[in-house]
Interface confidence: low
């Protein structure tokens, strides 16, 4: 009678993460007598997957029944397959022997290759809010897929931007890989309402990429412009002054009157305006009473937005010998200082 | 080469369920998602949905939920559209069509089409 | 939904001459679109893909072009072997959507 060959058919078998991998094996031959056991890997480090005489092998079942006499089938199950169970997979004969079953042929192997969808993409961008004209930095990463192939492209507003470096880990061989990618984007004046977004895609995805986003409002900073004007009087010896705060994001700003550099009311930024651009106006007005000043006065609009140092727009009133003249626009003058 | 083999046609009485298959030759089938298309007579294309080959997840077009059911079995690499409880406006031409590719980002359209199944609903 | 709109619905032509299909979307679908071409009792043939580019096999004559809202496909000389009715598909937005047909026939 012709020897025992051990045939495992599949070079190869490919399977979804989280499925049941079938790993085909059959013997041509009963004789001799003796076990099959099912290794992880080759030589003496190989790891023991099933053992058809012994042993607890939860995630395993025989595709056959292995207690019938004449059964040649010792095909298995893997259940709930991750990565980590890539790997060639070895059906080995045993002899039946004294004190121990002796190794007497081995099948070729399978090589059990298991796909994994990547992880949700995860951008992020710079810790500390950027100004209009600068460039960030966001990086977008994915982990746990496989095979290593993969594509990552990146988009603002929809268009795809071409700044940006990518590396996937491990270079080698791996159960699973990660894919890191940064790209710099500058901002302009019109980004509050802005996203950047990373897209992955990878053979496990059938073309529905994952996206990642960004808001670009987390991270940029749009200074204030400041506007001191003089208004028409309300009443007779008082002058309204305004300051226009245009085109500020985020809303955290705080605004002090000063007039001649003595502190005269501090108020925050509460009911603002919003811009179709996302950034906000506010204004804030001073009423003086000129007929209690002896001298010009200097006013000053300073502003203090997102805990950046201060900026300031100052005006020059003009106090005149004749307080009923005081109404009109020629009693004061907008020097438009700019005080940093 | 890449081909998507079809079943051959099919006469139902309403209210019976009818399995239309796709084989998918050339290629493997969990490497690209599979859409069905149905195309009623002297009509234009209708896209009914698609099924995730990799995940086995279906995705169902609006008029295609409920009685409309796609699967898989991939040990022989075909794709299935069921029809059940079936009606005289089904009658019509199944198309299976694969996806284009995934590393591409361009998921819908289709490369290569199954060659057709007529389904005739009849009392 | 996204409706795909094609013009004209039918046209007559011989062979040589130079035949352009429109295709209008309801909505800005980049330039997600694919052309089909299906012949009496066959099964559609895959034209253009990514509005422009044509799929392996497919004589150069054929050419897409658009992006947005309005495509066109474009057969520089027509062939005996293109009289067939054509299809633009949108694929920006689940569900995706054809056009109704363009019937291009013999004059």
């Known amino acids: 009678e012709e020897e025992l060959q051990v045939i495992q058919p599949d070079k190869s078998v490919l399977v979804a993460a989280g499925e049941t991998a079938t790993l085909r094996c059959t013997a041509t031959s009963l004789i001799p007598v003796g076990p099959i056991q099912w290794f992880r890997g080759a030589g003496p480090g190989r790891e023991l997957i099933y053992n058809q005489k012994e042993g607890h092998f939860p995630r395993v079942t025989t595709v056959s029944d292995l207690t019938k006499r004449n059964n040649m089938d010792f095909s298995i199950r893997i259940g709930n397959i991750t990565p980590a169970d890539a790997g060639t997979y070895y059906c080995v004969k045993f002899r039946k022997g004294s004190p121990d079953d002796v190794e007497f042929k081995s099948g070729a192997g399978t090589e059990l290759s298991v796909r994994a969808k990547p992880s949700a993409p995860v951008v992020s961008g710079p810790a500390a809010r950027a100004t209009p004209q600068h460039t960030v930095s966001f990086t977008c990463e994915s982990h746990g897929f496989s095979p290593r192939d993969i594509t990552l492209k990146w988009f603002k507003n929809g268009n795809e931007l071409s700044d940006f470096q990518t590396n996937v880990d491990p270079v080698g061989e791996s159960v699973s890989y990660s894919i890191h990618s940064t790209a710099k984007v500058v901002l302009t004046r019109e980004d509050v309402h802005s996203q950047v977004i990373c897209e992955v895609a990878h053979v496990t995805l059938q073309g529905d990429p994952l996206r990642g986003t960004a808001n670009l409002s987390e991270t940029i900073r749009v200074p204030p412009t400041l506007e001191v004007t003089q208004q028409p009087v309300r009443a007779e010896n008082q002058v309204n002054v305004t300051c226009q705060v245009r085109k500020f994001y985020p809303q955290r700003l705080q605004l002090t009157w000063l007039e001649n550099g003595n502190v005269s009311r501090t108020e925050t930024a509460s009911t603002v305006t919003e811009n179709k651009d996302g950034t906000y106006n506010w204004m804030s007005w001073l009423l003086v009473n000129v007929s209690a000043h002896r001298d010009d006065v200097k006013l000053t609009c300073q502003v203090e937005h997102d805990g950046q140092p201060a900026v300031s727009k100052s005006h020059d009133l003009k106090v005149s010998a004749h307080p009923k003249e005081q109404g009109s626009n020629t009693a004061a003058e907008n020097t438009g200082s700019n005080e940093r | 080469q890449i081909q998507l083999v079809q079943s051959g046609s099919e006469l139902k009485k309403p209210g019976a369920s009818v399995k239309v298959s796709c084989r998918a030759g050339?290629?493997?089938?969990?490497?690209?998602?599979m859409n069905w298309v149905r195309q009623a007579p002297g009509q234009g294309l209708e896209w009914m949905g698609f099924?995730?080959?990799?995940?086995?997840?279906?995705t169902y077009a609006q008029g295609f939920k409920g009685r409309f059911v796609f699967s898989l079995d991939t040990s022989v690499s075909t794709a299935y559209l069921q029809i059940g409880s079936l009606k005289a406006e089904d009658t019509a031409v199944y198309y299976c069509?694969?996806?284009?590719?995934?590393?591409?980002?361009?998921?819908?359209?289709?490369?290569?089409w199954g060659q057709g199944t007529l389904v005739t609903v009849s009392s | 939904d996204i409706q795909m709109t094609q013009s004209p619905s039918s046209l007559s032509a011989s062979v040589g001459d130079r035949v352009t299909i429109t295709c209008r979307a309801s909505?800005?679908?980049?330039?997600?679109l694919a052309w089909y071409q299906q012949k009496p009792g066959k099964a559609p043939k895959s034209l253009i893909y990514?509005?422009?580019y044509r799929y392996i096999g497919v004589p150069s004559r054929f050419s897409g072009s658009g992006s947005g809202t309005d495509f066109t496909l474009t057969i520089s000389s027509l062939q005996p072997e293109d009289f067939a009715t054509y299809y633009c598909?949108?694929?920006?937005?689940?569900?995706?959507?054809f056009g109704q047909g363009t019937k291009l026939e013999i004059k």
């Open positions: 069509a694969r996806t284009r590719g995934y590393y591409d980002f361009d998921g819908g359209a289709f490369d290569y």
């Open positions: 598909q949108q694929y920006n937005t689940y569900p995706l959507t």
């Open positions: 990514s509005a422009i």
């Open positions: 099924i995730n080959t990799y995940t086995g997840e279906p």
């Open positions: 909505q800005n679908v980049g330039t997600h």
């Open positions: 050339g290629y493997t089938l969990t490497d690209y998602a």
